[in-house]
């Protein structure tokens, strides 16, 4: 019995610079190491303190890397994604894509549900709204007879 | 915590040998990567060798690339360094070294290691 889980994703240009602690990260997934169901992308499984990408506060745990300095990170092992970092240079350009989850219920395996599909409290609330104004204003208007 | 302890060093001739190795407690050793560094005096610390987790990656800097080889054996949670045709400008503190497997940082990078240990002599004559 999975809930349905929604994000909210975003995408993002982050350029690091590598420093006396490296980038200062470590990465999952890879053709041959899924990190999840139906998606051999590359993820950030842990961000080293005092590292660059720490220092700069936007890269997050759990974001995907879909390109360093152009290349594109699909259908890798991920042995090749870890030594096309490991060669990237000294200023390094990522493309992430943050996945914000916007409501939590009963949920199966992460990267369940429709990640591009809009959060069900943003449909909810405004037609929640909506219907409260309505009732508001049909029970003024049956006071006015 | 990692705690790695060095042994093996010790005083030996030009174009002689030896066999540092390194034993890894407290964590599990085959989720790490490891690296050996080493000191001299008045020098900055320099990066040796390294290998991945697994043992299929290795990595070593010019100075050393035909002499000195690195490997691991998971089972004994320990890192080797055999050093063939030392020559005295070896002579250092070496330092086995440890991080988190599957860094997006080259090996050399020591600010991207987690633990170290304390350091064993290598003094070539």
């Known amino acids: 019995m999975n809930g349905r889980v929604d994000y909210l994703v975003t995408e993002e240009e982050i350029n690091l610079t590598r420093g006396p602690s490296g980038l200062g990260f470590n990465i999952v997934g890879g053709t041959d190491q899924q990190y999840v169901s139906n998606d051999s992308g590359i993820y950030v499984s842990r961000i080293k303190e005092n590292g660059a990408a720490a220092l700069d506060g936007r890269l997050q745990e759990g974001d995907k890397i879909l390109s360093v300095n152009g290349q594109d990170l699909k259908n890798l092992l991920h042995q090749d994604a870890v030594d096309l970092f490991r060669n990237a240079g000294y200023a390094v350009s990522l493309r992430v894509q943050h996945r914000l989850q916007v409501q939590n219920g009963p949920i199966g395996h992460r990267g369940e549900g429709d990640p591009s599909g809009i959060p069900i409290f943003m449909v909810l609330v405004p037609v929640f709204a909506l219907t409260m104004v309505a009732a508001w204003a049909f029970m003024r208007y049956r006071q006015q007879l | 915590d990692v705690q790695l302890v060095e042994s093996g060093g010790g005083l030996v001739q030009a174009g002689g040998s030896l066999r540092l190795s390194c034993v890894a407690s407290?964590?599990?050793?085959?989720?790490?990567?490891m690296g050996w560094f080493r000191q001299a005096p008045g020098k900055e610390r320099e990066f040796v060798a390294a290998?991945?987790?697994?043992?299929?990656?290795?990595d070593y800097p010019d100075s050393v690339k035909g002499r000195f080889t690195i490997s691991r054996d998971n089972a004994k949670n320990t890192v080797y360094l055999q050093m063939n045709g030392l020559k005295p400008e070896d002579t250092a503190v070496y330092y086995c070294?440890?991080?988190?497997?599957?860094?997006?940082?080259?090996?050399?990078?020591?600010?991207?290691?987690?633990?170290w240990g304390q350091g064993t002599q290598v003094t070539v004559s």
């Open positions: 070294a440890s991080r988190w497997r599957s860094g997006v940082d080259p090996y050399y990078y020591a600010g991207t290691y987690d633990y």
């Open positions: 407290g964590g599990t050793f085959s989720s790490y990567d």
């Open positions: 290998i991945n987790w697994s043992g299929g990656s290795t």
